[in-house]
């Protein structure tokens, strides 16, 4: 029979044959052969693999560094990574939660919808069409684009959610 060029789901092609992938929580020790199945081994303590895989090394669980204000929200398993969160009163700077701040700033392209208080974090919102924010800020709302018309100018460069419009002089047609 012809050697396969593609394999079923949860299989991979090697040496012209389809081998089973290792299940989540296990790593590859040796590929299958004509006579043997794929050999897999469970990940060690503090390691994980979260997909069907042919990895020869498991990934290390994330470390929630207390020096960065982090603590474990959910302990990792052989199939899942550890999830970190911030100490009470602090807030993650990103979804990955790699560091903590007292309250977040809104990135360029976003404005502050609600300023942080002693108990709640900053609430950001995307700048809608016609508005922009070019700075990271804990207080600033999105600013409206400059109205070139009111200055008797024309738009030379369109605005974005991160930049204001650029106005320029009107082209005067000579008689």
């Amino acid at each position: 029979p012809e050697p396969p060029t593609a394999c079923r789901e949860k299989q991979y092609l090697i040496n012209s044959q389809c081998c089973s992938l290792c299940q989540p929580g296990q790593k590859l020790v040796s590929d299958c052969t004509e006579f043997t199945e794929t050999e897999c081994l469970p990940c060690g303590e503090s390691e994980f693999l979260d997909t069907w895989n042919r990895e020869t090394h498991c990934h290390q669980h994330k470390y929630c560094d207390p020096n960065l204000g982090l603590r474990v929200q959910q302990k990792g398993t052989s199939e899942t990574d550890t999830i970190c969160t911030c100490e009470e009163g602090w807030h993650c700077t990103s979804e990955a939660c790699e560091s903590c701040v007292l309250h977040r700033s809104c990135s360029p392209g976003f404005g502050v919808k609600q300023i942080a208080t002693g108990v709640s974090d900053t609430i950001c919102e995307p700048c809608p069409v016609g508005f922009f924010s070019n700075v990271s800020s804990a207080f600033e709302k999105c600013h409206p684009w400059t109205s070139c018309e009111t200055k008797d100018l024309v738009v030379q460069q369109a605005g974005t959610n991160k930049t204001d419009v650029v106005c320029g002089p009107q082209d005067r047609l000579r008689a």
Epitope: N67, C86, S99, V101, S105, S137, A138, F139
Partner: nanobody, 116 residues
């Protein structure tokens, strides 16, 4: 390297006043929103006040509103906190910082003790 050094703390009687200063270096001061926070003995960090880049907008925790005033001098790279009508519960180490205030960098604080 970012450096933020708070000074001006001390022992003051209830009802008294103090003016804290924060000398900033290692970054472009006028491009940063700034913040004062404090930590009372045995307590967590508490936000006190923040100020916009230009100094035109200021924000205060309810506990200090009407008594404290934040300001800045961008030409001197310095942040200030004028504290009036001080109370025993204002006793804390005060830290200045950039927004957003990071857990892993607090700079050098100054101790304010309000006691008779």
């Amino acid at each position: 390297e970012v450096q933020l050094l708070a000074s001006g703390g001390g022992l003051v009687q209830p009802g008294g006043s103090l003016r804290l200063s924060c000398a900033a270096s290692g970054f472009t001061f006028e491009e940063e929103e700034m913040i004062w926070v404090r930590q009372a003995p045995g307590k967590g960090l508490e936000w006190v006040s923040s100020i916009s880049r230009s100094g035109g907008s200021t924000y205060y925790a309810d506990s200090v509103k009407g008594r404290f005033t934040i300001s800045r001098d961008n030409s001197k790279n310095t942040l200030y906190l004028q504290m009036n009508s001080l109370r025993a519960e204002d006793t804390a180490v005060y830290y200045c910082g950039k927004e957003p205030f990071r857990y892993d960098y607090w700079g050098q604080g100054t101790l304010v003790t309000v006691s008779s």
